[in-house]
């Protein structure tokens, strides 16, 4: 399987992880977290990094603690350096994580999913149009 296909699988997997965590919003610490929305073009990877850095936490209520902690850790899986390089290209012009509006876990996860969907769409579009920078 090609690297691009694996990349798409990983991105879709992140959406599934977000969906799973949305089932457990009542078991998450009700903390407000920076949640990028309407991310400007070329700042997607920077915003992605903000979502990964956010301190999403299990409320340790017992029942679903294990699956929540595993899922949160998988959400923080680092993409390869090629993607990191793309993020760095626009780092200076992208908003800092702290500048984004803070939202509770439910909205945080919804916005993360929205960004992931946008990134997948862009990736597919760039492949369709033969662009390498995806």
């Amino acid at each position: 399987m090609q690297g691009q296909d694996r990349h798409m699988i990983r991105m879709r997997q992140l959406i599934d992880i977000v969906d799973q965590l949305k089932n457990y919003v009542n078991d998450l610490v009700p903390e407000f977290l920076p949640a990028p929305e309407d991310v400007e073009t070329n700042c997607e990877w920077s915003a992605f990094s903000c979502f990964q850095k956010a301190q999403l936490k299990s409320a340790n209520t017992g029942n679903n603690e294990r699956i929540i902690n595993v899922s949160i850790k998988k959400l923080k899986r680092k993409p390869p350096s090629t993607n990191a390089g793309r993020r760095q290209k626009h780092r200076l012009t992208c908003p800092s994580c702290d500048s984004y509006e803070k939202k509770p876990p439910k909205e945080f996860l919804e916005r993360f999913k929205s960004l992931l969907q946008k990134m997948i769409h862009q990736h597919l579009s760039s492949r369709t149009h033969g662009s390498e920078d995806s």
Epitope: R6, H7, Q13, I17, Q20, N23, N64, R77
Partner: antibody, heavy 126, light 106 residues
Framework: QVQLVESGGGVVQPGRSLRLSCAAS????????MHWVRQAPGKGLEWVAF????????YYADSVKGRFTISRDNSKNTLYLQMNSLRAEDTAVYYC???????????????????WGQGTTVTVSS | EIVLTQSPGTLSLSPGERATLSCRAS???????LAWYQQKPGQAPRLLIY???ARATGIPDRFSGSGSGTDFTLTISRLEPEDFAVYYC???????FGQGTKVEIK
């Protein structure tokens, strides 16, 4: 080929300890989380413990928490299960299994246990 | 913690017949987190399906998985002699297994 081989099972008295080992070969051991799963005679599968690929996190079933310790030595491609304060209800075949979700972004992405050992039998009896 | 309930407990069928196995979760499961395993007597389990519907490497296409939310199904379109075994569903992340469904020869 990809392979997991368990060892260390045997007959032990209640309250005693035993250490199981699982030797991995044929894949990059340090890129995969690992599990222990057990099966009591005539019963279904019971997940026992999981350790992250780098050992940074460990999770346990409530039935073994505080008594069993999962660990790994990535330099030796080996997974361990230290079992203390053994009880009759710990009698089972113990399997080690590879978690199918590699730490590598471009690696395997299966949310499941995709490689299993043949199992080692632990009997707790006085 | 989530509970997975499999039904029926035992399925008695003949080779060539279709087998439909059910796995019901006590709370919603993202489809990526649902796996199925096959275990034959004296053998280790084998991963059949991951992500509710994707076949693991080397698994014949007579095996298929479907479902979402709390209801999942494993279907074996035409039973072969080697398919008579016990089947388990599992939620990834909590790693809880269902109690199993035995598919036996009628």
């Amino acid at each position: 080929q990809v392979q997991l081989v368990e060892s260390g099972g045997g007959v032990v008295q209640p309250g005693r300890s035993l250490r199981l080992s699982c030797a991995a070969s044929g894949f990059t051991f340090s890129s995969y989380g690992m599990h222990w799963v057990r099966q009591a005679p005539g019963k279904g599968l019971e997940w026992v413990a999981f350790i992250w690929y780098d050992g940074s996190d460990k999770y346990y079933a409530d039935s073994v928490k505080g008594r069993f310790t999962i660990s790994r030595d990535n330099s030796k491609n080996t997974l361990y299960l230290q079992m203390n304060s053994l009880r009759a209800e710990d009698t089972a075949v113990y399997y080690c299994a590879r978690d199918g979700d590699s730490s590598d972004w471009y690696g395997d992405y299966y949310f499941g246990m995709d490689v299993w050992g043949q199992g080692t039998t632990v009997t707790v009896s006085s | 913690e989530i509970v997975l309930t499999q039904s029926p407990g035992t399925l008695s069928l003949s080779p060539g017949e279709r087998a439909t196995l059910s796995c019901r979760a006590s709370q919603s499961v993202s489809s990526s987190y649902l796996a199925w395993y096959q275990q034959k007597p004296g053998q280790a389990p084998r991963l059949l399906i991951y992500g509710a519907s994707a076949r693991a490497t080397g698994i014949p296409d007579r095996f298929s998985g479907s479902g979402s939310g709390t209801d999942f199904t494993l279907t074996i379109s035409r039973l072969e002699p080697e398919d008579f075994a016990v089947y388990y569903c599992q939620q990834y992340g909590s790693w809880t297994f269902g109690q199993g469904t035995k598919v036996e020869i009628k």
